[in-house]
């Protein structure tokens, strides 16, 4: 009778095991082991026992001991069960961003692992088991469907294999896949709201605001603002589930014309976009041209107003005749025209909007000097010892220099408060002088003596 020890073995893949073949007869003619495995007989003493080291056991095997005794041949099998953990445990790749409300299918693939009867595949969200199934097929595949919720955001999904050899006196061997981190999002169907000027003048700055409500997670939303090919750099302010992106836009003559302003919001693997047109225009202020900005009294002056070819102008409130980009008027310069403003207003229609521009020029009229009775009375009579202020105003442009002298030397203190004395009495020659010439006027000061009672 042939016997084998151990009769059952569980060992790691590639491992070794000692198998003893024994026979009940004292003098077996033959005693050995039948196996395709590499074997080493340990050459131990004794006729009725042989010990073999079987090595590099890669798969389940059933080595057979045999002996040939006088009473016949017999055999005995030992059952070698190889265990090994899976070589590959992985979740099928998925986009990391998933919209809330979508059904997400998690698929775990397991390659290898034995014995399969002891191998289980578990799908998990965090530490919560979603599904547990035995490993079947090669590769084994386990799937489950998850309805994506807001609170799944940032959750880790993974797949774990459990090779449970505790019933065989070994341990529980676990292998876990790389985690799949789910990013959930909500991007509303409504496009973002875009507020911007419809028209924008060359070499000026405008403000663009793009906003959207109902986003999750709002901090992950990307906002792209662009005017034509020009990417804008917005400052983004976040609310609980909304954002507002504000950007300054500067335009140059190269941008003139109709440009597309876009605001795109990207969240997860979806986007929403709003398009708007902005008309970039060039409209310099109208030009007011005076024949000469400074003329002498009585000179003929031409005032011209010129504006953008498509503009319509009014000069000092009078529309151009015919209505168009040019207007002019003629005048003879009078002292009253000195400091007179000539205002040209131009109006241009851009994308249905009326744009107004003004330009003003001032005319300077040179005249004088003048000394007249109203502003420089010819006769003053003042009581002696009274306080008086001699007044004499010379007119002209440029403003004349005024001096009043008695006997060519004694000055009358114009505009100053003085105590009237006898010395003040007399006739003064007031001389007003400017680049335009000079005029004189006699001013007499009479001093009344007090009556003595």
């Amino acid at each position: 009778q042939t016997s084998v020890s151990p009769s059952k073995v569980i060992l790691p893949r590639g491992g070794s095991v000692l198998v003893t073949c024994s026979t009940s007869c004292d003098q077996p003619k033959l005693l050995g082991i039948e196996t395709p495995l590499p074997k080493k007989e340990l050459l131990l003493p004794g006729n009725n026992r042989k010990v073999y080291e079987l090595s590099n056991v890669q798969e389940d095997s059933q080595p057979m001991c045999y002996s040939n005794c006088p009473d016949g041949q017999s055999t005995a099998k030992t059952f070698l069960t190889v265990y090994w953990t899976p070589e590959r445990v992985e979740l099928a790749p998925l986009p990391s961003w998933q919209p809330v409300g979508k059904n997400l299918t998690l698929r775990c693939q397991v390659e290898g692992g034995a014995p399969r009867a002891n191998l289980t595949v578990v799908l998990l969200r965090g530490e919560k088991e979603l599904k547990r199934e035995p490993a079947v097929g090669e590769p084994a595949e386990v799937t489950t469907t998850v309805l994506v919720r807001r609170d799944h955001h940032g959750a880790n999904f993974s797949c774990r294999t459990e090779l449970d050899l505790r019933p065989q006196g070994l341990e529980l061997f676990e292998n876990t896949s790389a985690p799949y981190q789910l990013q959930t999002f909500v991007l509303p169907a409504t496009p973002p709201q875009l507020v911007s000027p419809r028209v924008l003048e060359v070499d000026t700055q405008g403000t663009v605001v793009c906003s959207l409500d109902g986003l999750f997670p709002v901090s992950e939303a990307q906002v792209h603002l662009a005017l034509g090919d020009q990417r804008l750099n917005p400052t983004v302010t976040y609310g609980n589930d909304s954002f507002s992106a504000k950007a300054s836009v500067s335009v140059t003559a190269e941008d003139e014309g109709t440009q597309r302003l876009t605001c795109a919001v990207i969240l997860g693997n979806q986007s929403q976009e709003t398009l708007q047109t902005v008309t970039i225009y060039s409209f310099p202020a109208p030009n007011v041209i005076l024949t000469k900005p400074e003329v002498s009294e009585g000179t003929e002056v031409t005032v011209k107003c010129e504006a953008h070819p498509r503009a319509k102008v009014t000069l000092n409130g009078v529309p151009a005749q015919p209505l168009g980009p040019r207007a002019q008027l003629l005048l003879k310069a009078t002292p009253e025209d000195n400091g007179r403003s000539f205002s040209c207003s131009a109006t241009l229609e851009v994308a249905g909007q009326l744009i107004h521009k003004n330009q003003t020029r001032e005319l300077r009229v040179l005249y004088g000097p003048r000394l007249d009775e109203r502003d420089c009375p010819g006769n003053w009579t003042w009581p002696e010892n009274s306080q008086q202020t001699p007044m004499c105003q010379a007119w002209g442009n440029p403003l004349p220099e005024l001096k009043c002298l008695k006997d060519g030397t004694f000055p009358l203190p114009i505009g100053e408060s003085v105590t009237v004395t006898r010395d003040l009495e007399g006739t003064y020659l007031c001389r007003a002088r400017s680049t335009q010439g000079e005029v004189t006027r006699k001013v007499t000061v009479n001093v009344l003596s007090p009556r003595y009672e």
Partner: antibody
């Protein structure tokens, strides 16, 4: 094919050391016992000892225990027979032989080397 | 220790049958292997496990084993069969030993 190739003939003086070799090819060298057999001039075969190259497990004949050392280097599939101090009586032909692999037993030497002649003379 | 006894020489005419014996205590309970060694050559296994012939060995070689004697029989002997023949067993009493017989010189007349 399975082959055992031994090193060439040696002529030595008494007291000298010697190592002869046996290189296996055509099979998994580590998985079979290699035995050494002496044949003195005009005499029969004498078993000296045996080694398992996989782990260098060794058994010696009582007649040769302490007289020779059997070793192996599995990285180069070679077994060795060595003496630390030769005597004239060590003059002989030495054979290495691979112990069998038959599934119905493994007791015979089924493959032999060509032999190495060792001459010890002063 | 276990001992194997062989006749030192056996002579036979070509074409005849040669019989070489190997004696040992209760040798029939052991497996016996036979080796042929031609002059100047290494031994070659010709019979193992009493009567099995390795591949490449002619059918003229056969073996048997019972009681206290194992026998190697060579039928229709040829000149090329002239060689020394050795029997071998393993002895596992109190250890592991390989035992060779003293050898038999077969002469083809």
């Amino acid at each position: 094919q399975v082959q055992l190739v031994q090193s060439g003939a040696e002529v030595k003086k008494p007291g000298e050391s010697l190592r002869i070799s046996c290189k296996g090819s055509g099979y998994s060298f580590t998985n079979y016992w290699i035995g050494w057999v002496r044949q003195m001039p005009g005499k029969g075969l004498e078993w000296m000892g045996i080694i398992y190259p996989g782990d260098s497990d060794t058994r010696y004949s009582p007649s040769f225990q302490g007289q020779v050392t059997i070793a192996a280097d599995k990285s180069i599939s070679t077994a060795y027979l060595q003496w630390s101090s030769l005597m004239a009586s060590d003059t002989a032909m030495y054979y290495c032989a691979r112990r069998g692999s038959r599934s119905s037993g493994e007791d015979a030497f089924e493959v032999w080397g060509q032999g190495t002649t060792v001459t010890v003379s002063s | 220790s276990y001992e194997l006894t062989q006749p030192p020489s056996v002579s036979v005419a070509p074409g005849k049958t040669a019989t070489i014996t190997c004696g040992g205590d209760n040798i029939g309970s052991k497996s016996v292997h036979w080796y042929q060694q031609r002059p100047g050559q290494a031994p070659v296994l010709v019979i193992n496990y009493d009567s099995d012939r390795p591949s490449g060995i002619p059918e003229r070689f056969s073996g048997s084993n019972s009681g206290n004697t194992a026998t190697l029989t060579i039928s229709r002997v040829e000149a090329g069969d002239e060689a020394d023949y050795y029997c071998q067993v393993e002895d596992r009493r109190g250890g592991y030993h390989v035992v060779f017989g003293g050898g038999t010189k077969l002469t083809v007349l």
